[in-house]
């Protein structure tokens, strides 16, 4: 056929457009071409010719007369995707062909399974709640909206925002609780997620909080605690951040904490803790248990020589700690602890309440009243001070025979001997582990001579027992350990005096220096048992109000007692020892005064010594309790002068029945020494300790005092 003048090659006048269509839906890809003769149209997908109904009448693709490609339904599977791709239409006639622009046919898709289903959420009211959702895979990418209890949520409410699959409720309310469904949607349709439950709980709140309370000992007390929340909170109580000790407390149905009979140990902070699965709240209140004042150590009558020093102990307890003050009967003048001492005043009150009067005058005689005062009550105690001439100075009581250590059987009987003498005649009392004994225990009695008898022994009776002989001239104590076991003796061996060595003769003074006294004595009278060793006891009114053991295990009948104070009057006694125990004491020595401080040695400028010593600054560290009866004392020295011989560790008891104002000394006689161990201390007692540098008779400034309390050994069960 020959070219006709009016013929022209094909040209595409309508190009197909990109289309996204749902699987199973019909769609059309348009294509219109001009040309003469009229061009034939064919379609190509991804470079391959597309089969239509022209090729197979059963085909789901139809070529329309206009040239458009019509799909009866889009076929698209998980794997086979025969309709998806890039299409072009080609128009042909004998003059040539024209190819349309590419048009992509994409199949919209929305799978059933959510990439992330929302999960149940539990929140506390007021907290934000976040429900997360990732819709099923789809094309175009599905958007989401949310339904609550099947009703679409309006995200215009300011508390609610929907961002990237997250539903956020900023400030949840009880009314927000319900079933939430995430809906994924695109042109294919909608898919509902599995529902998720939002539970809005309320954290615990207090309707009624416990309040601080102040009660007297033995009174009842209640702490109320009312709470609400959802779920109903559990309520528990704590005391001082620890679980409540068992047995002392009742917790009522409404969570009120009740203490029937308060004790001082009940004092503290009580915390009501309300907890549920969304929160925990705490409310606390303090309990103050007021205990009326009580005497721990009462002042006792004392007879003291003129010029001496006397201390009246007055130790009290209570809650709050009682304020203690003293007055002399008939005087308006009140004396308080820590009061700056008035010029010319010889009276002072220690922080623990002990009254000390120095340089006793006849006019000091009379009654002294210790008063203890708190909001919970007041108490008072009187003690008489008798002033005697120096010559009638009387030593403290002497314990002739004290208790012996013993091991006895359960259900057996203990006899703890204590025979004392003195002028005036002493009163005998007993302590167990430092505390008054026997109290109300009917098994224990103090017999006429002072012997302590304990029947039907129990393991718990094991302990250290102390006999205290007290009179107005002082007190003396003697301790022994009782060990109660299953296999001990059934009754105390009651040593006859014939089993013990006889008392030595009256000690004679053979030499005196400013710090020592040499004594000699004879063994007990012939016919008494021999002694294996001796002990020496000393007393000085200006040092202490009790006899002190100054030497132990002395093997000879001549001995120098060292570490004494210069210019001080001492009395000495000696006791003999054998395996059965201690003898009665020897008669007292005559009073002996140590030498006065001698003039300074030749060649030493005493002003220089005193100046240098005065510049030494001793810093005492906190003492360390090593055992119930030993304490380690350590110190540092800021400047070490050339004139220093050693350090005097001074200590005194400031609590307990034997509290005194007299210092005991332990000399560390090496200038380089910086520690010392105090031994033979009493258990469970507070000591005041200080350190003083010295050179010959010259003494430097005391360190600051430190206090330490020795421990109390628990009786073995």
């Amino acid at each position: 056929s020959r070219l006709r003048q009016e013929d022209f090659p094909p040209r595409i006048v309508e190009h197909p457009s990109d289309v996204i269509v749902s699987k199973g839906e019909p769609t059309t890809l348009n294509c219109k071409a001009e040309g003469r003769p009229t061009p034939t149209i064919e379609w190509y997908k991804d470079g391959e010719r597309v089969e239509t109904d022209k090729d197979d009448p059963r085909s789901h693709r139809m070529l329309l007369p206009s040239g458009s490609l019509f799909f009866l339904r889009i076929v698209h599977g998980r794997r086979s995707k025969p309709d998806e791709g890039s299409y072009v239409c080609v128009a042909r006639n004998y003059l040539g062909e024209a190819v349309s622009r590419n048009a992509s046919l994409e199949v919209a898709l929305l799978r059933d399974d959510f990439r992330q289903n929302p999960t149940d959420v539990v929140v506390a009211a007021g907290e934000p709640a976040i429900l997360e959702c990732q819709p099923p895979r789809g094309h175009p990418e599905p958007t989401i909206y949310w339904k609550k209890d099947k009703v679409r949520i309006d995200d215009k409410e300011e508390r609610i925002s929907i961002r990237g699959g997250k539903l956020m409720i900023s400030n949840t309310r009880k009314s927000d609780a319900g079933m939430y469904t995430c809906v994924g949607t695109n042109m294919v349709g909608e898919r509902d997620s599995d529902p998720a439950e939002l539970t809005v709980f309320e954290r615990p709140t207090f309707l009624r909080r416990p309040i601080n309370q102040v009660v007297l000992e033995e009174e009842a007390v209640e702490f109320r605690c009312q709470v609400q929340g959802d779920p109903q909170p559990t309520v528990r109580w704590k005391k001082d951040d620890a679980d409540l000790p068992r047995g002392r407390y009742d917790i009522k149905d409404d969570y009120t904490l009740r203490i029937k009979k308060t004790m001082s140990t009940d004092e503290g902070t009580y915390m009501c803790i309300a907890e549920n699965r969304v929160g925990k709240m705490e409310a606390s209140a303090t309990l103050t248990v007021r205990a009326p004042p009580q005497f721990v150590v009462r002042p006792r009558d004392q007879i003291v020589a003129q010029g001496r020093t006397v201390t009246f102990p007055c130790e009290t307890k209570g809650n709050p700690q009682p304020a203690v003050f003293w007055q002399k009967e008939g005087s308006q003048n009140l004396l308080f602890p820590n009061q700056p001492q008035q010029p010319n005043s010889r009276c002072s009150v220690s922080p623990t309440g002990d009254l000390t009067i120095t340089n006793i005058q006849r006019s000091d005689a009379g009654y002294y009243i210790c008063q203890a005062l708190t909001v919970a009550g007041s108490i008072l105690a009187k003690a008489q001070l008798e002033v005697t001439d120096v010559l009638t100075d009387r030593p403290p009581p002497i314990i002739l025979q004290g208790p012996a250590n013993q091991t006895l059987a359960v259900d057996g009987t203990a006899l703890l001997k204590c025979k004392a003498t003195g002028d005036p005649l002493p009163v005998i009392s007993w302590l167990k582990e430092g505390f008054t004994f026997p109290g109300r225990d009917p098994r224990a009695t103090i017999q006429e001579q002072g012997t302590l008898q304990i029947k039907n022994l129990r393991i718990s009776d094991t302990g250290t027992y102390t006999c205290v002989a007290t009179s107005s001239s002082g007190e003396t104590s003697w301790s022994a350990v009782l060990d109660v076991t299953e296999s001990g003796a059934t009754i105390s061996k009651n040593y006859d005096l014939s089993d013990l060595p006889g008392p030595p003769s009256k000690p004679q003074v053979t030499d005196v220096t400013k710090n020592s006294v040499t004594l000699s004595w004879q063994p007990g009278t012939p016919g008494t048992l021999p002694a294996s060793a001796y002990i020496i006891e000393a007393f000085s009114q200006s040092v202490s109000n009790s006899w002190q053991t100054v030497a132990n295990h002395v093997k000879t009948t001549l001995y120098t007692v060292r570490g004494l104070r210069p210019n001080t009057i001492y009395l000495f006694m000696v006791r003999a020892i054998n395996p059965q125990g201690l003898s009665d004491p020897s008669p007292m020595s005559d009073p002996v005064r140590t030498q006065d401080i001698s003039p300074p040695a030749q060649g030493v400028d005493h002003r220089q010594v005193q100046k240098e010593l005065g510049d030494v600054l001793v810093r005492l560290h906190n003492p360390v309790v090593l055992t119930p009866t030993t304490v380690q004392v350590t110190w540092t020295v800021d400047r070490q002068p050339q004139f220093i011989q050693g350090y005097r560790v001074m200590y005194r008891q400031t609590s307990g029945l034997q509290a005194t104002s007299s210092w005991q000394n332990l000399d560390a006689k090496v200038p380089t020494e910086r520690s010392a161990v105090l031994v033979n201390l009493k258990k469970g007692v507070t000591y005041e300790i200080k350190v003083r540098p010295y050179f010959n008779e010259f003494q430097g400034m005391d360190s600051e005092s430190k206090t330490v309390r020795t421990t109390e050994e628990a009786p073995s069960a």
């Epitope: 089969e51 599977g77 086979s80 025969p82």
Partner: antibody, heavy 118, light 105 residues
Framework: QVQLVQSGAEVKKPGASVKVSCKAS????????MHWVRQAPGQGLEWMGW????????EFPQKFQGRVTMTRDTSISTAYMDLSRLRSDDTAVYYC???????????WGQGTMVTVSS | DIVMTQSPSSLSASVGDRVTITCRAS??????LNWYQQKPGKAPKLLIY???SLQSGVPSRFSGSGSGTDFTLTISSLQPEDFATYYC???????FGGGTKVEIK
């Protein structure tokens, strides 16, 4: 019309390999996945894997991995299944089947009997 | 792998009977389930796709139902040409059930 025509029966010795062909016609070969299914005498149908003729991607169940190979030649619209290291229990009728856009095997070949015998 | 369990493995029925075959998947497969009919010496033939859609050219006495894990093929009134073996197939992992042989009573 749309059809799949498979190669003829084969008799093989144990340890040998067999290659079965499947020629497609009447549709766009690259538009549909091709699967292979076998049926031992008196037994049920066992799916062996697929090939995407468009790009040659394949997938097989664990049981056949390492022993089966599936290939295609788009120029002649033919798919092939090669099974190596034959055993007597590989004796079966082997079918090729086209997967429709509805995720089902809508067109099947007539089957190829493969006998493995020493 | 998802395991397909068909029951019964065989059944006897008469022409005109209503026949039900069940197929259970070991885990949810949504609606991705197909049913095939196979006659002796012939290739299988697709009856139902996507659990309930009837393939073009298949008589309407065949119907499918179910989703998730439990599926059913029902022949409402058995015809002589329906005596054959029927297979279910899940189209996620493409495995077949064990088959149910429908025989003449």
């Amino acid at each position: 019309q749309v059809q799949l025509v498979q190669s003829g029966a084969e008799v093989k010795k144990p340890g040998a390999s067999v290659k079965v062909s499947c020629k497609a016609s009447g549709y766009t070969f690259t538009g549909y996945y091709m699967h292979w299914v076998r049926q031992a005498p008196g037994q049920g149908l066992e799916w062996m894997g697929w090939i995407n003729p468009k790009n040659g991607d394949t997938e097989f169940p664990q049981k056949f991995q390492g022993r089966v190979t599936m290939t295609r030649d788009t120029s002649i619209s033919t798919a092939y299944m090669d099974l190596s290291r034959l055993r007597s229990d590989d004796t079966a009728v082997y079918y090729c089947a086209r997967e429709s856009g509805d995720d089902a095997f809508d067109i099947w070949g007539q089957g190829t009997m493969v006998t493995v015998s020493s | 792998d998802i395991v397909m369990t068909q029951s019964p493995s065989s059944l006897s029925a008469s022409v005109g009977d209503r026949v039900t075959i069940t197929c259970r998947a070991s885990q949810s497969i949504s609606s991705y389930l197909n049913w095939y009919q196979q006659k002796p010496g012939k290739a299988p033939k697709l009856l139902i796709y996507a659990a309930s859609s009837l393939q073009s050219g298949v008589p309407s006495r065949f119907s499918g139902s179910g989703s998730g894990t439990d599926f059913t093929l029902t022949i409402s009134s058995l015809q002589p040409e329906d005596f054959a073996t029927y297979y279910c197939q899940q189209s996620v992992g493409l495995f077949f059930g064990g088959g149910t042989k429908v025989e003449i009573k």
